[in-house]
């Protein structure tokens, strides 16, 4: 879902915090992608985003490799990245970026993060000169309280991110419970 | 002009299964969802499940085993199925388009088709 | 599930009334509520999305208010062709529940 034209800017890192403490190992597993915003996000009238799930796997050399898997072209899509710890703990960058083209920043941010049932992390890319971001809503299971939901709405706006811009992708029968 | 009509076998025999077909106009079976919902006499509306515009679906965790639903969108044509039918799945059967994104509302509704399991 | 009530089944008005009609959801649906109207001929038509969002062609009479648990849909100015059941919806959480509906009455 890309509407690039006039993107909302990314805001300063100053005002995205930090999971304090954050613990590599109990982030792993499987997170499903319950709430989903950003400034290439745009909620359509007609049918909704449909729900994702990633999967976090910690390597040897403390690297994720990140999978996420969603329903495209009436099957089961595959997408593998590695995510490369930062500057601290919770921090991540994009490995092997030069693969990517035109691709020249990538940057993750666990926001916050209780691991066994909800976590926010911030996503920060340039591609093609154009700066992005996102923050995912991550849930263990396919639905969070209305409380969770509502602290995802916030923290988004306080980003600068309209309601349009904020959307909680449906449960679907496919791929995400393989 | 959008419309959807149901159209099902009204009588279906305890055990066997019913096939419901929505038959749209006005509008594309790619861009929209269409549900597949039911009132029994007497109760509440029940949503049941549906198939989105991408051909992905989503169903009533509590009826799913029993449930399948397709389409054919150049037909314009949703299919509706449910299995091991009973009395109490005596029903009105609606399909209604998806509408407003993530607000999951539904904007037409067909007239709806009387099934009795007897 | 969720279990959406609406208390009052049948109500009887006078055209011209303003005519307001609940919904109480078993938990918080956080504005995720829609409200249709069922004609006596079976026709359903989408009234009001996310508590308070007016359908295309809905007339300006019809409007919707609420949050948390506790919702309502307003008819100002009652019109005959309002006379039909009213029942609203949950898109907050699967699965997507109804309210078992209130029917209008002519006195």
């Known amino acids: 879902q890309d509407s690039t034209s006039d993107l909302i800017p990314a805001p300063p890192l100053s005002k995205v915090p930090l999971q304090q403490n954050f613990q590599d190992n109990q982030f792993q597993g499987k997170w499903y992608v319950v709430g989903l915003a950003g400034n290439a996000i745009l909620r359509e009238d007609k049918d909704p985003q449909k729900m994702y799930a990633t999967i976090y796997e910690l390597k040897e050399d403390k690297s994720y490799n990140v999978t996420s898997v969603l329903f495209r072209k009436k099957k089961c899509d595959y997408w593998i990245r590695t995510f490369v710890p930062g500057c601290q703990p919770g921090e991540f960058t994009l490995g092997n970026i030069k693969s990517y083209p035109g691709l020249t920043s990538y940057l993750v941010r666990v926001v916050s993060t209780n691991y066994n049932q909800h976590a926010m992390v911030f996503f920060k890319k340039v591609s093609q000169n154009r700066e992005y971001f996102k923050i995912t809503l991550y849930g263990r299971t396919k639905e969070l309280t209305s409380e969770l939901k509502e602290n995802f709405i916030r923290f988004s706006k306080s980003l600068g991110l309209p309601e349009n811009h904020i959307v909680f992708p449906v449960p679907i029968d496919q791929c995400i419970d393989g | 002009e959008v419309q959807l009509e149901e159209s099902g076998p009204g009588l279906v025999a305890p055990s066997q299964s019913l096939s419901i077909t929505c038959t749209i106009s006005g509008f594309s079976l790619t861009s929209y969802g269409i549900h597949w919902l039911r009132q029994p006499p007497g109760k509440d509306l029940e949503w049941l499940v549906v198939?989105?515009?991408?051909?992905?679906?989503t169903s009533n965790s509590a009826l799913k085993s029993r449930l399948s639903i397709s389409k054919d969108n150049s037909k314009s044509q949703v299919f509706f199925k449910m299995s091991g039918l009973q009395t109490d799945d005596t029903a009105i059967y609606y399909c209604?388009?998806?509408?407003?994104?993530?607000?999951?509302?539904?904007?037409?509704w067909g007239p709806g088709t009387s099934v009795t399991v007897s | 599930d969720i279990v959406l009530t609406q208390s009052t089944s049948s109500l009887s008005v006078s055209l011209g009334d303003r005519v307001t009609i609940n919904c109480r959801a078993s938990q918080d649906i956080s504005n995720y509520l829609n409200w249709y109207q069922e004609k006596p001929d079976g026709t359903v038509k989408l009234l009001i999305y996310?508590?308070?969002r007016l359908h295309s062609g809905v007339p300006s009479r019809f409007s919707g208010s609420g949050s948390g648990t506790d919702y309502s849909l307003t008819i100002t100015n009652l019109e005959q062709e309002d006379i039909a059941t009213y029942f609203c919806q949950q898109g907050n959480t699967l699965p997507w529940t109804f309210g078992g509906g209130t029917k209008l009455e002519i006195k």
């Open positions: 198939i989105w515009g991408d051909g992905s679906t």
């Open positions: 209604a388009r998806h509408r407003y994104s993530d607000y999951h509302a539904m904007d037409y």
């Open positions: 996310f508590t308070s």
